[in-house]
């Protein structure tokens, strides 16, 4: 059928709560593509009726809520004028009693459900919530060992739980809870997070600073090669990830097939008080679909983007 098959890693999911997965892969960024979700190679697409428990919402597949029988392989087909990608996503639903203290975490949980706090530092946990804009998320409540977290060492800030002066006792099982509203109905999202601790120096609560880019546009001709550096200052011995992402996906993963856009090797220079890191992004050939798309440089909790734009027409050529 002429579609390129792409296999995503397995997702482990908790039953009886909402779940959403966004189908993102080039060239989904232009308006000239159609996205259709299917289950288990069925010829019948997933419903687009918002009242359906499982339905397609723009590029997302949305489960309201996910149920035990929903495990399986889902395909998202992205059709462009000259291209077709079929993305296979294996969803495994498990029953998890987050308050079952006999279970120490879960094997093969995705990384966002395994987080690390740095002993003696001010650090934070993140509640990862990936839902389409039709889903309205309420304030987040945080729990440890099934008890709501209180105390002056803990502060809730948007999707993060800030923990000051982390101690060994802060390790263990956490959960973040949020009420999701969709089409007037309310659902509970409860994400369990296995939290381990380390003495190794973290970033000490400081936020990496992205020197460049600055959420700016770059004029670039179609078809040219472009290399853009992301310059970041951060504390020595920090443990922050520095990377380029597009549509919330690492560029190397996003362009895994064509390798047309790649992240470069990170380099750094050491100064007395901080390190200066550089990680570049290379566009081997700028294509039309790249324009107007934010390419994000991430460094820990910091992010900044560049956006490519076509140069203004040079009327002197006429």
């Amino acid at each position: 059928d002429g579609c390129n098959d792409i296999f995503m890693k397995n997702e482990m999911l908790s039953a009886s709560q909402p779940f959403a997965f966004n189908c993102t892969f080039p060239p989904i960024t232009s308006g000239e593509v159609s996205v259709t979700w299917y289950k288990n190679s069925s010829k019948i697409p997933v419903s687009k009726i918002i009242q359906s428990r499982i339905h397609q919402d723009e590029t997302w597949i949305l489960f309201l809520p996910m149920e035990w029988g929903d495990s399986g392989v889902y395909q998202c087909v992205i059709k462009g004028r000259d291209s077709c990608h079929r993305i296979h996503v294996n969803l495994t639903v498990f029953e998890k009693q987050w308050c079952d203290t006999s279970v120490k975490g879960l094997p093969n949980l995705s990384d966002e459900y395994k987080q690390i706090l740095h002993l003696g530092k001010d650090d934070s946990l993140t509640c990862h919530l990936h839902f389409p804009k039709s889903c309205i998320l309420g304030p987040i409540k945080w729990y440890k060992d099934c008890n709501e977290i209180t105390g002056e060492r803990f502060t809730v800030l948007e999707t993060r739980l800030l923990v000051s002066n982390v101690s060994a006792e802060d390790r263990g099982n956490y959960a973040c809870q949020v009420i999701l509203t969709h089409s007037g109905k309310q659902y509970e999202v409860l994400n369990g997070i296995t939290v381990s601790i380390t003495e190794r120096a973290g970033y000490g609560g400081s936020v990496p600073k992205i020197i460049y880019p600055k959420n700016n546009s770059i004029e670039v001709q179609l078809g040219t090669t472009l290399i853009v550096d992301c310059n970041i200052t951060d504390t020595k011995d920090n443990t922050n990830l520095r990377c380029w992402r597009v549509n919330n996906t690492l560029v190397d993963d996003y362009y895994n097939e064509s390798k047309r856009i790649r992240e470069g090797v990170e380099t750094h220079a050491s100064f007395r008080e901080y390190n200066l890191y550089t990680v570049n992004i290379t566009f081997l050939e700028v294509k039309m679909e790249d324009y107007g798309l934010p390419f994000m440089c991430h460094a820990g909790v910091s992010a900044a983007y560049i956006m490519l734009q076509l140069p203004a027409p040079d009327f002197r050529a006429y």
Epitope: D111, A168, T198, R200, A201, N238
Partner: antibody, heavy 120, light 106 residues
Framework: QVQLQESGPGLVKPSQTLSLTCTVS??????GYWNWIRNHPGKGLEYI?????????YYNPSLKSRVTISRDTSKNQYYLKLSSVTAADTAVYYC??????????????WGQGTLVTVSS | DIQMTQSPSSLSASVGDRVTITCRAS?????MYWYQQKPGKAPKLWIY???NLASGVPSRFSGSGSGTSYTLTISSLQPEDFATYYC?????????FGQGTKLEIK
């Protein structure tokens, strides 16, 4: 069950580069700290460095100019390269990881170790 | 660098003896980790966060200490306890080990 397995040549010539692979099963290297440690014959343990789940690396300053730790997440492997080796680098090399009782620094899982001899 | 000095370097003792191994750090450390190693084998985590016994470690072992002085104690030595014990700190990089204490049968 988390398992680690070191592999690589057991004999390296002086001035060459020592290259070892640690293959991990039962856990993903995109979570936690992945360490290299060595044990000189008849001497104690020496911490070489680690690669963090984010890709960040830390090296013992005494080896920093010669050591590189990298990884391949698709193979769930991480690597040690030690350049310009001398006889003093002859040792049993271990890969290890923590996470026991949610403590990343408690190195609970170790490979069986691989002896690397530097000799011409 | 924080230097870790274990004493004694070697120790001959008999089954049933009470044995104490000391680890001194050149600067304050927050926690101590202890490993047991037998010849030809990889080290095993023995005690973590100063006083917590790893899985399978008999209760005759205990760990204590703070600041610059930490101890591993065996209340009644058993034949399987003869091995080399290493302390390690993570408070400050580089993450240093002690030179080891070899526990031998008298």
């Amino acid at each position: 069950q988390v398992q680690l397995q070191e592999s690589g040549p057991g004999l390296v010539k002086p001035s060459q580069t020592l290259s070892l692979t640690c293959t991990v099963s039962g856990a993903s290297i995109t979570s936690g700290y992945w360490n290299w440690i060595r044990n000189h014959p008849g001497k104690g343990l020496e911490y070489i460095g680690y690669i963090y789940y984010s890709g960040y690396t830390y090296y013992n300053p005494s080896l920093k100019s010669r050591v590189t730790i990298s990884r391949d997440t698709s193979k769930n492997q991480y690597y040690l390269k030690l350049s310009s080796v001398t006889a003093a680098d002859t040792a049993v090399y271990y890969c290890a990881t923590g996470g026991y009782d949610y403590v990343e620094d408690a190195l609970y899982y170790w490979g069986q170790g691989t002896l690397v001899t530097v000799s011409s | 660098d924080i230097q870790m000095t274990q004493s004694p370097s070697s120790l001959s003792a008999s089954v049933g003896d009470r044995v104490t191994i000391t680890c001194r750090a050149s600067s304050n450390v927050r926690y101590m980790y202890w490993y047991q190693q037998k010849p030809g084998k990889a080290p095993k985590l023995w005690i973590y966060l100063t006083s917590n016994l790893a899985s399978g470690v008999p209760s005759r072992f205990s760990g204590s200490g703070s600041g610059t002085s930490y101890t591993l104690t065996i209340s009644s030595l058993q034949p399987e306890d003869f091995a080399t014990y290493y302390c390690q700190q993570y408070t400050t990089s580089p993450y240093t080990f002690g030179q080891g204490t070899k526990l031998e049968i008298k």
